[in-house]
């Protein structure tokens, strides 16, 4: 767990507290929150960066996904429980002993209950599709310019393999970015998509979470790329367990 | 143990095109692992021309974008080099090499081989 | 493109010494830079990734460390086999990876 050495910050999170602690005095961070070490080479999970932001909520995302499956966030801002890897625990509850089950970015995918609800896996989001609307430009951006640069950013600021962006979608004003992992196609050391696609999100809201880096700055050919609105559609390996009342 | 070997002419005619083949052994080329060629003229410094991910589009150094070419056949497990309009200046060994991580550094290179633009 | 400049070009050292070989880049990397040792002759091979982290088979003499613009390889103890050239390379930016101009380790 080592971070910037020059001035002891971790450039892949602010939301962090470093000191020369580590061993051989090297920089160690550790997440606000829940004072977890992160490795500052990588992305900080999710879990860890909700935890950590608790202490300043901003509004509530909307998470929806358009299939008889949708998951629609409308929870807001929780202070969720991480395990020791930093990911969500199947189980959240909150302080007033409602519980609930969620999917690994955190997303709730049961009814709410009481302490005795289980949750016996974490279920994994294997499929995230990001609907962005950008800001009306002169002409359409071509679709393979598009596509080039969005992998791009992946790949660089995210350090997401570009197997696990399936496919960008575009028809002005629309764009739509696919990112696919499987369980099983998820190696050690590699991104979660579910992590990247929150990185990203954060960023075209302008709130992004690297250490004094500009912010994004998305460009497709010179001409800028300006989101205007973000929607982040979920599927989960297993479909959530709602009861027909929340369906009607 | 992964090796790789390049294969091809050793002179190739002004304004003609360098066609070299890097073959791998040890490894399969459908794997985690992005596959480069990378060149350094005589005495100078080394120079990264571009990558390939099986299944996935290949990258190019913008500086030789126009002229480059690189592709994968898995059914031999080899990638090749295609490199048009050369001049003299193109001269020079060319390895290929095995990119790891997300970002390519290349933790297996081929021996290299020496290609010489003359007429 | 990320610029990668290395100091000094050509250095001289005898077995036993302890050098210092500096690279930095254009803009941060934050910890994507590897460092390579060339022979005459041969291919290149990679001794550190990641800034710091040893490749495997590689002697614990090598050491790598800087994070941001500025890097540094250091050979604690110059062994025969150490007089080369070497090379880091940034892997921060695929468009393009960039490589600096190498670094000579010759026998003074």
């Known amino acids: 767990h080592t971070a910037a050495q020059d001035n002891c910050t971790c450039p892949t999170n602010k939301m962090t507290v470093c000191s020369p602690d580590g061993p051989g005095g090297r920089c160690q961070c550790r997440a606000l929150g829940s004072g977890v070490a992160v490795d500052c080479s990588t992305l900080t999970s999710e879990c860890l960066l909700l935890k950590a932001r608790m202490s300043a909520p901003k509004n509530a995302r909307t998470l929806v996904r358009p299939n008889e499956h949708a998951l629609v966030d409308n929870d807001g801002l929780y202070d969720p429980d991480c395990d020791p890897e930093g990911r969500f625990k199947a189980r959240q509850c909150n302080q007033t002993s409602v519980c609930w089950c969620v999917n690994s970015v955190g997303v709730r995918r049961t009814d709410k209950g009481d302490l005795s609800l289980r949750c016996d896996e974490l279920v994994r989001t294997h499929h995230i599709l990001i609907d962005l609307r950008h800001r009306p430009t002169a002409g359409a951006f071509n679709h393979s310019d598009l596509d080039a640069e969005l992998r791009r950013l992946f790949r660089e600021r995210y350090r997401l393999h570009p197997k696990f962006v399936a496919a960008v979608h575009y028809e002005q004003p629309t764009i739509q970015i696919e990112l696919r992992q499987n369980t099983s196609q998820k190696a050690a050391g590699d991104v979660d998509i579910g992590d990247a696609a929150y990185y990203f999100e954060r960023d075209v809201k302008g709130e992004s979470l690297f250490q004094g880096r500009g912010g994004l700055d998305l460009r497709v050919r010179g001409e800028p790329l300006q989101v205007e609105r973000t929607l982040i559609y979920y599927l989960d390996e297993i479909p959530p367990k709602f009861s027909m009342k929340r369906l009607t | 143990q992964v090796q790789l070997q390049e294969s091809g002419p050793g002179l190739v005619k002004p304004s003609g095109t360098l066609s070299l083949t890097c073959a791998v052994s040890g490894d399969s080329i459908s794997s985690n692992n992005w596959w480069s060629w990378v060149r350094q003229p005589p005495g100078k410094g080394l120079e990264w021309i571009g990558e390939i991910y099986p299944g996935g589009n290949p990258n190019y150094n913008p500086s030789l974008k126009s002229r480059v070419t690189i592709s994968v056949d898995k059914s031999k497990n080899q990638f090749s080099l295609k490199l048009n309009s050369v001049t003299a200046a193109d001269t020079a060994v060319y390895y290929c090499?095995?990119?790891?991580?997300?970002?390519?550094?290349?933790?297996?290179w081929g021996q290299g081989t020496l290609v010489t633009v003359s007429s | 493109d990320i610029q990668m400049t290395q100091s000094p070009s050509t250095l001289s050292a005898s077995v036993g010494d302890r050098v210092t070989i500096t690279c930095r880049a254009s803009?941060?990397?934050?910890?994507?830079l590897a460092w390579y040792q060339q022979k005459p002759g041969k291919a290149p091979k990679l001794l550190i990734y990641?800034?710091?982290s040893l490749e495997s088979g590689v002697p614990s003499r090598f050491r790598g460390s800087g994070s941001g613009t500025e890097f540094t390889l250091t050979i604690s103890s110059l062994q025969p086999d150490d007089f080369a050239t070497y090379y880091c390379?940034?892997?921060?930016?695929?468009?393009?990876?960039?490589f600096g101009q190498g670094s000579r380790l010759e026998i003074k």
């Open positions: 990641k800034a710091s």
């Open positions: 803009q941060s990397i934050g910890h994507w």
């Open positions: 090499a095995r990119g790891s991580g997300v970002i390519s550094y290349f933790d297996y």
């Open positions: 390379q940034q892997y921060s930016s695929y468009s393009p990876i960039t």
